[in-house]
């Protein structure tokens, strides 16, 4: 069964800056990744970035840099300033569309006990939805 993992980290140098990393643990070919915050995409969440493996990347403030880290994982840097900046308990979600598995989404937030610059290891987050 495919899984999606989400890791959220607050940068030590900028306390309002976050790095979100997401990965897909499956054998299928990824066709699209959507990163959102405030809840799952399409369920109250706001899209931060959409990444296509070949067509390109689209991102919106406060996202600063979205990129592919590997063929099955992405990262997104958020810079916080003003009303749209993330806070420590913000939920971030990543949705991977793949063939033939379908769409898989998981969410995560900053570990409550983590110090700036530290984060929990990138273990698979609970899968919220699998649209096959």
């Amino acid at each position: 069964t495919p899984e999606v993992w989400v890791q959220v980290r607050m940068e030590a140098t900028e306390l309002s800056s976050f790095t979100i990393r997401c990965g897909f643990l499956g054998s299928g070919s990824i066709s699209l990744v959507t990163v959102s915050w405030g809840g799952p995409n399409g369920a109250g969440g706001t899209t931060l970035a959409v990444l296509h493996p070949e067509r390109g990347i689209r991102q919106w403030a406060p996202a600063r840099q979205a990129r592919w880290e590997t063929q099955s994982s992405i990262s997104l840097i958020l810079e916080g300033s003003g009303a749209s900046s993330p806070c420590a308990n913000t939920t971030f979600c990543c949705k991977f569309a793949s063939f033939p598995e379908g769409s898989w989404e998981a969410c995560g937030s900053l570990p409550p006990s983590s110090d700036p610059g530290l984060s929990a290891p990138p273990t698979p987050a609970p899968i919220l939805r699998a649209d096959l």
Epitope: T46, V50, P53, E54, R55, G56, R58, W60, A61, R67
Partner: antibody, heavy 114, light 113 residues
């Protein structure tokens, strides 16, 4: 199949504004950005910016900040671009596009002339 | 901004012959993470909007004839039409899809010799 249908040609006076519409059908309107591209007569293609209809998040080409303003209405699946303080140099065909420029509207000719 | 430069500006090729258009970017369009090049090619005929032909430097958009092919990596890319047809007469544009703002080449006008 996504279809983008734009509003008709406009003739405007210098200093005025114009609002171009782009109505989408056949796809998920709020999931992907609507891009706006300008093509002056006999010239190449120039990206103006984009709007993500679901959240009204925008990105603008620095060159067009203050000139173009994007809005979107998810209830009618329509994106809008307003161009202000029009000058003769703004005479061009304006295109909307979606899904990484895979789908295009037919274009809207805006002519600025006194 | 990434500057896209196409060559030649215009090109005349006989029907059935090969047409080659080059595109050079001022910065690499290769995403090191997934080893994909974010470059697209478009065809524009008079009075029509551009049509996406190639994305990811070499992937044909659905419905595009297989005589169109794209190649290259990093900063140097090529669009090839293996056997020119009359309906291929158009202006062709390359585009940076790697970073904001998306920028286009100045265009290459392809005609029949």
């Amino acid at each position: 199949e996504v279809q983008l249908v734009q509003s008709g040609a406009e003739v405007k006076k210098p200093g005025s504004s114009v609002k171009v519409s782009c109505k989408a059908s056949g796809g998920t309107f709020s999931s992907f950005s609507i891009e706006w591209v300008r093509q002056a007569p006999g010239q190449g293609l120039e990206w103006i910016g984009e709007i993500l209809p679901g959240s009204n998040s925008t990105n603008y080409n620095e060159k067009f900040k203050g000139k173009a303003t994007f809005t979107a209405d998810t209830s009618t699946n329509t994106a809008y671009m307003e161009l202000s303080s029009l000058r003769s140099e703004d005479t061009a065909v304006y295109y909307c596009s979606s899904y990484w420029f895979a789908y295009w509207g037919q274009g809207t000719l805006v002519t600025v002339s006194s | 901004d990434i500057v896209m430069t196409q060559s030649p500006d215009s090109l005349a090729v006989s029907l059935g012959e090969r047409a080659t258009i080059n595109c050079k970017s001022s910065q690499s369009l290769l995403n090191s993470g997934n080893q994909k090049n974010y470059l697209a090619w478009y065809q524009q005929k008079p009075g029509q909007p551009p049509k996406l032909l190639i994305y990811g430097a070499s992937t044909r958009e659905s419905g595009v004839p297989d005589r169109f092919s794209g190649s290259g990596s990093g900063t140097d890319f090529t669009l090839t039409i293996s056997s020119l047809q009359a309906e291929d007469v158009a202006v062709y544009y390359c585009q940076n899809a790697h970073s904001y703002p998306p920028t286009f080449g100045q265009g290459t006008k392809l005609e029949i010799k």
